[in-house]
């Protein structure tokens, strides 16, 4: 016999990302003896909760909690039994619940209470279900991206930690109901609400962040639909040959379409709406989502929101990735420059329904929404955030880094479990278990 060194014990953490359109569960793991190291926490597994987001259960809160059961049962299998009690479990809800909280705070509270009741039934260390602010969603996404890409600190060959010279990456998240932009900036923000000061591993970071509610992909599509009904009677962003029955109650139930809601409308009425494959009218429709008329600061992105000039490299994830990936992979279109992105959006918007279906087979009706989605992403980046060709060259569209989904969930867990210390790590001897 010979002595065999056992691998280090693993610790686990679970985050339920309760988005506007669906909920995802992420299970993270890390070696127990290296808790303060950077880049050491990784994704162990994930699970997509069937059905809509928890905000869609406003009239049936118990349905929200019931929907989580399948993934929670999977978590019981994925996390070793002896680790259950020590595994923190968090639920964070984002813009879908922020919207519900605006329109129906009682329903929002009921949904959170219902999911809390279910989550406490499991043997994990449940640490709460809450609605994240837009600022938190942006910052935690930024933390996730930079943690995974090891931009905060690294362990060098000489046995000491150092801060990489390459600086941090900006983060852009496009969710279902909101979109966030977050990046490190040198000068103080003119709008204090857009600035966050962070202390990570002994380093100080001044970060600009803003979340635009109602500018997530799904809400943008609803707003464009409302505009199309109002101004055209046809949808310029939908492909010619595609038509569907639109339930007015669905279009106008969101606070995001309140401004376009007619005085008197029958919520149960259905209107037939057809596409016209008109990229120019579609671009005009999308442009209407952004206001550049007034800015109370030295410079703004849109809607009077302060934003310093975009600087450095960025990672764009969630629906940014899915939209650009669709153009690149499914449509076979180049998207390496802003000009190419615009041309790709125009190309998709020119397609008839027959052409689009032939190019991308076996898809549900939301295939018809890729034109609007592409046009919105292109306009948001170029006109909204002010990326020029040079700055756009520094944007990478990514879904995962180091086999871990990029999003706010990991950053949220790292923060709440104190896995990123504020102080610099001291020198410590490492043990190689390979």
């Amino acid at each position: 016999t010979r002595d065999v060194r056992e691998p280090p014990a693993l610790k686990y953490g679970i985050v339920l990302d309760a988005g506007s359109s669906h909920t995802s569960m992420f299970i993270y793991k890390w070696p127990a003896d290296k808790e303060n190291d950077t880049g050491i926490v990784g994704q162990h597994s994930s699970c997509d909760v069937p059905g809509g987001g928890i905000s869609s259960y406003a009239d049936n809160p118990s349905g929200a909690s019931q929907s989580l059961v399948g993934c929670l049962e999977q978590a019981l299998q994925d996390v070793p039994k002896e680790r259950h009690a020590g595994t923190p479990l968090y639920l964070g809800a984002t813009a879908g619940m922020r919207l519900l909280n605006l329109t129906n705070p009682e329903a929002s509270t009921s949904v959170l209470m219902a999911v809390t009741h279910t989550l406490t039934q499991y043997p994990f260390d449940f640490r709460g279900a809450r609605i994240l602010s837009g600022q938190e969603e942006g910052v935690f996404g930024w933390v996730t991206a930079n943690y995974l890409l090891e931009n905060f600190i690294k362990y060098g060959w000489v046995g000491r930690w150092f801060r990489p010279r390459k600086g941090t990456l900006g983060a852009m998240d496009l969710g279902g109901a909101s979109t966030q932009i977050t990046f490190e900036t040198t000068s103080p923000a003119e709008d204090r609400a857009s600035e966050v000061q962070l202390h990570l591993y002994g380093q100080h970071y001044r970060v600009y962040t803003h979340s635009f509610l109602c500018y997530g992909r799904d809400q943008v599509l609803q707003r464009l639909l409302a505009s199309a009904l109002q101004t055209h009677g046809f949808h310029p962003c939908w492909p010619r040959g595609f038509s569907t029955q639109v339930l007015l109650g669905d279009v106008y139930q969101s606070p995001c379409t309140m401004a376009q809601r007619p005085q008197n409308f029958n919520s149960s009425a259905r209107v037939s709406l057809s596409g016209s494959s008109d990229p120019h009218l579609c671009r005009d429709l999308v442009s209407g989502l952004f206001s550049f008329s007034s800015c109370p600061f030295s410079r703004c992105s849109f809607n009077g929101v302060f934003q310093p000039p975009v600087a450095g490299n960025f990672v764009a994830f969630s629906a940014f990735f899915y939209t650009v990936d669709f153009l690149r992979t499914s449509m076979g279109l180049p998207v390496a420059t802003l000009q190419q992105l615009e041309a790709a959006a125009v190309n998709v918007c020119n397609q008839t329904w027959a052409q689009l279906q032939a190019r991308v087979p076996g898809q549900r009706a939301r295939l018809a929404d890729y034109c609007a989605g592409a046009m919105f992403v292109q306009q948001l980046l170029s006109r909204g955030y002010g990326f020029d060709e040079r700055a756009f060259g520094g944007v990478i569209f990514q879904k995962k880094a180091a086999d871990t989904a990029v999003g706010w969930a990991l950053g949220y867990m790292l923060n709440l479990t104190n896995l990123i210390p504020a102080d610099p790590p001291g020198l410590r001897k490492g043990t190689d278990f390979s």
Partner: antibody, heavy 120, light 108 residues
Amino acid sequence: QVQLVQSGAEVKKPGSSVKVSCKASGGTFDSYAVSWVRQAPGQGLEWMGRIVPWLGFTRYAQKFQGRVTITADESTSTAYMELSSLRSEDTAVYYCARESPGYRYSFDVWDQGTLVTVSS
Amino acid sequence: SYELTQPLSVSVALGQTARITCSGDAIGEKYVYWYQQKPGQAPVLVIYDDNNRPSGIPERFSGSNSGNTATLTISRAQAGDEADYYCASYDLQQARWVFGGGTKLTVL
């Protein structure tokens, strides 16, 4: 009633190429697409790539990228699949399948397939 | 990359109901197609868009799809239903058709 008719069985040496044809008899490729799917002996179905002749649009499975070329001649309603750098693992029945708009471009008409044997 | 998982084999008594599953991440968000393949023959489309039958396919064949599982149901199974069954779905992320590994249905 559209039928697909493929070329006959082939025996090829490792390292060589094979080109299989698929003709739509009793119809054209207008509004249709053609996929190529292979099946190794005793194995499952494996999608290789597709072409939308009327759009000149092709897509290939990553596994075959750079090794497979799918083309179509609209005038003769014939699709072709060429696979290069053949190895013994490429021994399989190669099917062409029509993708129809009526079925959201899933495979509604298949030919009986072409057996390609790769052997030294 | 996206994968579809099927049981290797399913057995059913003559006249009873057979259920063949096909699982994949959030498969309920995609359309699923089912193909029947008998020995020495080309595959035949039996279900498209989750639950629709092409003309000529008996009503005994039906499909469903939600969450992470799609199911092909064959009621009143007959000896002639013995075959390999494949589910398929289009993977938007890699722009490719994906087939499940196939399920051998045996009618006892």
